[in-house]
């Protein structure tokens, strides 16, 4: 038994990092592998993650992280049973990749505005609380050329557009993600998308 | 919102002990370190020692190596800094403070006074 | 004793910008990161900088930090009267065995 692709993980700056991995064939992750990780510091403990399939040959591993900071570093040993297939370490705030904002809701009824809200994934005592900005994709569900990003740079988590910039009449969809500078972090998976019908009063030609 | 309540102030003779306690609240208790801090009075802090609230190992300054003993209850959320064979340098605020590689919370502080 | 060394005391007037520096070596600063804490008169330190340079939540981006090589640099802009405390920097000594080491203290002075 061999590792064919080694693991490499993300982390959401929170509670949990991800990693992936291939082995050289079909295998049962959960009850040929274990996966070690223990943070280098003072005290620390080693942890045990048992790993799911990902896949014929690929694993996955969710390893839960309490209190990550920029000075964390882990290492981490695949073990098969009594044998070492792989020694490695991982710094999560090099590693980023936020969670998924939710909550996102399209209110229709502010003045021919359409106003878009989501809720910030991460506590106000989490650093990338006040350092994530957002893109919004809005797509219509009947012309697949109507799809179009709006880049969210300020921290509120909003955006604010007229809604005779889409087309009156038919249905929307909307999903958001989010990124963080600070740690060039990879941008989060979208957030499910909400779904609204646009309609608005088209101005009166004199 | 996280809480570090530390017990009242303390006057002891030279060479007796002292255990200060640290309840916490807020928080997970388990999940994050927590450390013992001094000051005597006018000086500036010294770092005494991390207790590991999860498993309870603990690491001290070598200046206290021998003398001071840190402990934790799970079930109460407490945390406990013992330090014996009290000298009259050892008068000081001790405070408790949560924390990995820096102190986020602090106690409010105990103030212990050896005296004879 | 400290290996962190801070200038005793700084002092400015209101609405001016002072940083208090903090000097160590290759096994702590040079090797480590750096927290920085204000402690107002009475009471108990507060984290006021970790990670080098990153602000805890709900405090002011008047405060900001620095490091470079083994020092580090706390920034304080737009001086009020209640920033009137003793800051002391720290930081992980990675000597055998490893353990947090603090500043002298630096008491600042609003004029």
């Known amino acids: 038994m061999k590792v064919l692709q080694e693991p490499t993980c993300v982390s959401d700056y929170m509670s949990i990092s991800t990693c992936e991995w291939k082995m050289n064939g079909p295998t049962n992750c959960s009850t040929e592998l274990r996966l070690l990780y223990q943070l280098v510091f003072l005290l620390s403990e080693a942890h045990t993650c048992i790993p799911e399939n990902n896949g014929g040959a690929g694993c996955v591993c969710h390893l839960l992280m309490d209190d990550v900071v920029s000075a964390d570093n882990y290492t981490l040993d695949l073990w098969a049973g009594q044998q070492l297939l792989w020694k490695g370490s991982f710094k999560p705030s090099e590693h980023v990749k936020p969670r998924a904002p939710g909550n996102l809701t399209v209110h229709t009824n502010v003045s021919d505005t359409l106003l878009l809200t989501w809720s910030n994934p991460y506590p106000p005592d989490n650093y990338l609380y006040n350092h994530l900005t957002y893109a919004v994709n809005i797509w219509s569900e009947n012309d697949p050329a109507d799809f179009r990003i709006y880049n969210v740079t300020y921290l509120e988590p909003s955006l604010r557009i007229a809604a005779s910039t889409l087309k009156s009449g038919i249905s929307y969809r909307a999903r958001v993600r989010a990124w963080a500078q600070c740690y060039n972090t990879t941008w989060s998976e979208w957030s499910p998308s909400t779904k609204w019908h646009n309609s608005y009063r088209e101005p009166f030609e004199q | 919102q996280v809480q570090l309540v530390q017990s009242g102030a303390e006057v002891k003779k030279p060479g007796a002990s002292v255990k200060v306690s640290c309840k916490a609240s807020?928080?997970?208790?388990?999940?994050?370190?927590m450390h013992w801090a001094r000051q005597a009075p006018g000086q500036g802090l010294e770092w005494m020692g991390i207790?590991?609230?999860?498993?309870?190992?603990?690491s001290y300054a070598q200046k206290f190596q021998g003398r001071v003993t840190m402990t934790r209850d799970t079930s109460t959320s407490t945390v406990y800094m013992e330090l014996s064979s009290l000298r009259s340098e050892d008068t000081a605020v001790y405070y408790c403070a949560r924390g990995k590689w820096w102190l986020y919370n602090w106690g409010k502080g105990t103030l212990v006074t050896v005296s004879s | 004793q400290s290996v962190l060394t801070q200038p005793p005391s700084v002092s400015a007037a209101p609405g001016q910008k002072v940083t208090i520096s903090c000097s160590g070596g290759s096994s702590n600063i040079g090797n480590s990161y750096v927290s920085w804490y204000q402690q107002l008169p009475g009471t108990a330190p507060k984290l006021l900088i970790y990670?080098?340079?990153k602000r805890p939540s709900g405090i002011p981006d008047r405060f900001s930090g620095s490091k470079s090589g083994t020092s580090a640099t706390l920034a304080i802009t737009g001086l009020q009267t209640g920033d009137e405390a003793d800051y002391y920097c720290g930081t992980w000594d990675t000597s055998s065995p490893p353990q947090p080491i603090f500043g002298t203290g630096t008491k600042l002075t609003v004029l």
């Open positions: 807020g928080y997970a208790f388990t999940s994050y370190y």
């Open positions: 207790i590991n609230p999860s498993g309870g190992s603990t």
């Open positions: 990670d080098n340079n």
